[in-house]
Interface confidence: low
């Protein structure tokens, strides 16, 4: 217990001293991420710009509770996820043996005193292709390279079109068609591209992260987790070792 209090105190020391009584904190997340089917991914959030004490962090997927990291009680993993969810690093959560059904929104919900609840959102896309591995780490360079490639190809096509407009009209039409198909294929696997129709993103459920603000009866019931939890003796949550 004392160790836990020390951890929370240390967490407080890390935060910028701001005026109390206002929710001044911000949640930084890993944002939109992608991973390969069968692989693993780390979901990470970090609360900053507040002196509030973090008492608990909930991890939820749409309307399902994944795990809880409580300052007093330690980690709790939902039984339905205990084989595929590992606590940490820090206050983060590691998802293992990913399936396409894991695609969707994930929420980190920070319960703090005296500020209240902070919610961060992460969108995870689980891809069939090994492109996902590169997409997770090299998302921006990859998109940049793709864009540059398209520009070069388009420029080349324009030149070809200009030179052979009258003589090879049918051939040009075929090339343009091929380019369109190639471009569409690249965008489909782009980590930042919206999920195509028929994908496993479940959007019909209200994001659980909103419950901290509205406190409606449905949300309150949603947050009565206790029958779906399994306590794991993993020690106390390290509230100052998060690497967000």
């Amino acid at each position: 217990m004392r160790w836990c209090l020390l951890l929370i105190w240390a967490q407080g020391l890390r935060q910028a001293p701001l005026a109390s009584g206002m929710m001044t904190g911000t949640i930084e997340t890993t944002g939109n991420i992608s991973a390969e089917k069968g692989g693993s991914i780390i979901l990470q959030c970090h609360l900053s710009s507040t002196t509030a004490q973090v008492t608990q962090v909930n991890w939820e997927q749409q309307d399902q509770l994944l795990a809880i990291c409580n300052a007093d009680l330690g980690w709790h993993i939902s039984p339905s996820f205990k084989d595929r969810v590992a606590p940490g690093p820090g206050l983060g959560l590691t998802l293992q043996s990913l399936t396409v059904n894991d695609t969707g929104e994930y929420f980190c919900i920070y319960h703090t005193y005296p500020d209240g609840t902070y919610t961060g959102r992460i969108f995870l896309e689980v891809l069939e292709s090994s492109v996902a591995e590169h997409g997770a780490r090299f998302q921006i360079p990859l998109l940049g390279a793709m864009a540059a490639t398209l520009v070069v190809i388009c420029t080349a096509v324009i030149v070809v079109v200009a030179l052979t407009r009258k003589k090879k009209a049918l051939r040009i039409h075929s090339v343009e068609g091929d380019l369109r198909r190639k471009s569409a294929g690249q965008e489909e696997w782009s980590p930042s591209a919206p999920s195509p129709p028929g994908s496993c993103v479940q959007a019909e459920a209200a994001p659980a992260g909103l419950c901290g603000e509205q406190r409606g009866e449905d949300c309150a019931e949603l947050h009565d987790y206790f029958n779906v939890l399994s306590y794991r003796s993993l020690g106390n949550c390290s509230f100052f070792t998060e690497t967000g």
């Epitope: 008492t55 608990q56 809880i68 409580n70 300052a71 007093d72 009680l73 319960h111 005193y113 406190r215 309150a220 019931e221 947050h223 009565d224 987790y225 206790f226 029958n227 779906v228």
Partner: nanobody
Framework: EVQLVESGGGLVQAGGSLRLSCAAS????????MGWFRQAPGKEREFVST????????YYADSVKGRFTISADNAKNTVYLQMNSLKPEDTAVYYC???????????????WGQGTQVTVSS
Amino acid sequence: EVQLVESGGGLVQAGGSLRLSCAASGSILSSYTMGWFRQAPGKEREFVSTISRSSTRTYYADSVKGRFTISADNAKNTVYLQMNSLKPEDTAVYYCAARLWGTWTAGDYDYWGQGTQVTVSS
């Protein structure tokens, strides 16, 4: 104002059983999550068990899992804690608490009873 009154405490030998009751004023069980905490002499108050407002969801501290059972009777507006296979280390003042929102930590409970003493002798 919600009032919680515990009863059922007492002196029992190790291995014995007790059933604690927590009577709540007003029809709050359908709106509140109820919990039991305990505080041993010289120690901090610790979580024991909780039951959701629909009485379908329960949670127990590791130290009491398999020995204690929490239940609720909405008609009687009462929450129970059945304690079996009691151990000397279960000796403490047991408190009933109610919360409308929040987590299971003590600080999130809105209302508390005055407590009932449970003493387990070896």
